[in-house]
Interface confidence: low
């Protein structure tokens, strides 16, 4: 209309798809009787009736919109359900009354593309290749508007390079309006990126602000010749029997050559091909003292049909033989004595120490171990160590179970533990004995045993924190045949005032969870970026 | 070697505009991210703005969204700090520097002084 | 925006003293196992520089009486033997969010 002043810039809504678009109708009482409103849609210039409202009441107009509008706000918002991106378009109201005005909305959609998924050239890249290969595909599938590729090498990104990197970018637009886009890179590439980790990177906006996602990281198979073959021992050092023991071949080409590994036998001195994996990796698991020997390794190329065969390797497998103690198992009366004797062989000089399983001190120094007027607290684990002081980690150990006759033991007489009323306690009830007891409980819950050692048995029960509980609390009955004993844990209710129990009372063993906290672990490497500048 | 070398700075009135430039040299500009420090006469540093040269993806300091504008000009090795409604407290030392993706700044220019006064 | 409160804001030293720093955010800036802490030197009239990252790293041409440490909210910086050349101004900044945001320096003076 000549005159008229220029409009003014549409107010900006944001929303994802599927969601529900509010369009208010920003007319002031000065513009408009929001009573009296009609609402338009623009799409490329064309301006299609969409709502009327009369004297507050809304009516949709036939069409794509129909089904999906309803008035709020007593009349001043649109409502616009399951937004598509279909519906990015200027939204208009238009007071009639006093006189005509509009208000414009731009209605902005966006959606989140499904997490990239990165799809390696499988062929491989040979490195004397004259210009860029396929690396790898990156297809990012219903996003809106286009999301942004960025691709990565070892984590720094890639950017188009004459003759070295090309970037190929796609988009196609789905029925639904989504584009999904698809990204090709291609590259040229050295030795060196044999081993180079490369990922595509999605980003995009949504209403809260910039986001992206990473594909997983991939390596591209690249090939080069072979020059040099050679074996390697895994691991390091000093191999002790009992190790896992990896003797492989490896090449500086790829693809590699085919690869037999090679042990010289002791008595004929002939070299005995092994038996290796299907990777070619001749696996020691556990190592024994047999497998020491002369090892070399040959590489054929079967293209060329030449032979390369690397340096001999010795390797000596340390071992200490099985630990023996004697008596295996005893069990003896309160007051008896006991000799304890460890026994074994190694190709080294052995040293031998007693420890107490549970404390871990050191009892003795030497093969035996000499225990006198036992008392029914000596009962438990004694381990004999065997070792070889110059090769740390080579050893054996034996552990043996002295048991003492008696009743059962409990970890603890009474004690006191507190709860707050409808939490579910988490109870717990040691009790050592020979023979090993059982543990009952005088009150319903879910129980379970767990065995700590063959005298030793730990029972731990799941129950509801109630009234009768508080007043009767809860006993836990250790039992064998030659006896019984109760612990009794004492429950008292703690209020949000009070502060930890004093040093002289304990919750000892017994844990209690007032509501469970479930946290699902997220493995999405979506992130949340900062709000970029507004879209313009 | 690496560097950078901030320009542009003066004096200027308020309300009025200023543009810096930061100029950079032995190393590939669009692998690293560019970010504009200020620091004020006997003040602290407080981080403006970042770019990614190889992208022209921007991040903002959320107290200069609107008045302040990053950008660059690969060809140039350069990147710009558009600076619009200017005021007083904008007086200060304006600083470029690189980083990589963990955001520690490894170079930094010399600094261009930016004094807003009528 | 992660807070970063320096201490102490200054400080007097000798040459030869052991100096420590300390940087604390208002909320943690350690993500799986990296710690996002800087520290940076700064001399009047020049421009910062990085002396250590991401928490412990000692940046390349510093020297190795500079190290750092800490992790979630509580950091330091730590000069073992002070030299004549390190009476400057410290910063540390944090690059867990956006904005990155430095402490309020603390100004390491001679005795």
């Known amino acids: 209309v000549p005159g008229e002043a220029e409009q003014p810039a549409p107010e900006l809504v944001e929303v994802e798809v599927g969601s529900t678009a509010l369009l208010k109708c920003g007319l002031s009482q000065s513009q408009g009787n929001l009573s009296h409103v009609d609402w338009f849609s623009v799409h490329k210039e064309k301006r299609t009736l969409i709502f009327r409202v009369r004297q507050g009441q809304g009516q949709s107009e036939p069409g794509e919109y129909e089904q999906r509008l309803s008035l709020q706000d007593r009349g001043a918002t649109l409502a616009l359900t399951q937004v598509t991106p279909q519906d990015e378009r200027i939204f208009l109201c238009q007071g009639k009354r006093p006189r005509s005005q509009e208000y414009r909305i731009q209605l902005r959609v966006y959606k989140a593309p499904e997490e990239p998924n990165i799809q390696v050239n499988p062929l491989g890249i040979p490195v004397n290749s004259k210009e860029p290969e396929e690396v790898a595909t990156c297809v990012g599938r219903n996003g809106y508007p286009i999301p942004q590729v960025i691709w990565y090498k070892n984590g720094r990104p890639l950017k188009e390079e004459k003759n070295r990197v090309h970037i190929q970018s796609s988009q196609t637009v789905e029925s639904s309006g989504l584009y999904t886009l698809q990204s090709i890179l291609k590259a040229q590439l050295v030795k060196e990126d044999k081993d180079a980790q490369f990922y595509c990177e999605l980003n995009y906006r949504l209403p809260s602000g910039n986001h992206m996602k990473e594909s997983r990281e991939v390596t591209v198979p690249v090939f080069y010749p072979t020059e040099k073959v050679w074996l390697e021992v895994e691991p390091v050092g000093m191999l002790k029997e009992g190790d896992r023991v990896e003797i492989r071949c490896l090449a500086d080409g790829n693809p590699p050559p085919h690869f037999s590994i090679s042990k010289q036998n002791p008595s004929t001195r002939e070299a005995e091909e092994e038996t290796t994996n299907d990777n070619g990796v001749l696996v020691l698991e556990p190592a024994r003292k047999e497998h020491s020997g002369r090892y070399e390794c040959q590489g054929l190329d079967l293209d060329t049909m030449i032979s390369l065969l690397s340096e001999p390797q010795e390797l000596l497998v340390n071992y200490v033989s099985d630990v023996r103690v004697s008596p295996a198992a005893p069990e003896r009366q309160e007051g008896s004595s006991l000799t304890l004797t460890c026994e074994a062989e190694s190709s080294q000089d052995l040293e031998f120490q007693w420890l107490r399983e549970e404390t871990g001190q050191v009892l003795e120094r030497g093969p035996v171990l000499q225990l006198h007027d036992l008392k029914r607290e000596a009962g438990g684990g004694y381990r004999c160590v065997a070792s070889v002081p110059s090769i740390p980690g080579l050893n054996r150990t034996q552990l043996v179970n002295v048991a003492i006759f008696g009743p059962p033991w409990m970890a603890f007489k009474e004690r006191k533990v507190w709860v707050k009323e409808n939490m579910v306690l988490n109870l717990s009830c040691e009790a050592s004995g020979h023979p090993r007891p059982t543990i009952s409980w005088n009150v319903n819950g879910t129980a379970s045993e767990q065995d700590q050692d063959p005298q030793r048995v730990l029972s731990t029960l799941n129950v509801l924190v109630t009234p009768e509980l508080l007043e009767t609390g809860v006993e836990c009955t250790a039992s064998n045949d030659l006896g019984k004993n109760t612990s009794i844990l004492f429950l008292e209710l703690v209020n949000l005032t009070t502060l930890t129990p004093d040093s002289n009372t304990t919750t000892g063993l017994s844990t209690s969870t007032a509501s469970p906290h479930t946290r699902a672990n997220s493995t999405s490497t979506e992130r949340k970026l900062p709000e970029p500048e507004s879209r313009g | 070697q690496v560097q950078l070398v901030e320009s542009g700075g003066g004096v200027v009135q308020p309300g009025r505009s200023l543009r810096l430039s930061c100029a950079a040299s032995?190393?590939?500009?669009?692998?690293?991210?560019i970010h504009w420090v200020r620091q004020a006469p006997g003040k602290g540093l407080e981080w403006v703005a970042r770019i990614y040269p190889g992208t022209d993806i921007t991040y903002y300091n959320e107290k200069f969204k609107g008045r302040f504008t990053i950008s660059r000009d690969n060809s140039k090795n350069t990147l710009y700090l558009q600076m619009n409604s200017l005021r007083a407290e904008d007086t200060a030392v304006y600083y470029c520097?690189?980083?990589?993706?963990?955001?520690?700044?490894?170079?930094w220019g010399a600094g261009t002084m930016v004094t807003v006064s009528s | 925006e992660i807070q970063m409160t320096q201490s102490p804001s200054s400080l007097s030293a000798s040459v030869g003293d052991r100096v420590t720093i300390t940087c604390r955010a208002s909320k943690s800036v350690s993500i799986s196992g990296y710690s996002y802490m800087h520290w940076y030197q700064q001399k009047p009239g020049k421009a910062p520089k990085l002396l250590i990252y991401?928490?412990?790293n000692l940046e390349s041409g510093v020297p190795s009486r500079f190290s750092g440490s800490g992790s979630g909210t509580d950091f330091t910086l730590t000069i073992s033997s002070l030299q004549p050349e390190d009476f400057a101004t410290y910063y540390c900044?944090?690059?867990?969010?956006?904005?990155?945001?430095f402490g309020q320096g603390t100004k390491l003076e001679i005795k």
């Open positions: 991401l928490a412990s």
């Open positions: 520097a690189r980083s990589g993706g963990y955001w520690y700044f490894d170079v």
């Open positions: 900044q944090h690059s867990r969010e956006l904005p990155y945001t």
């Open positions: 032995g190393f590939t500009f669009s692998n690293y991210w």
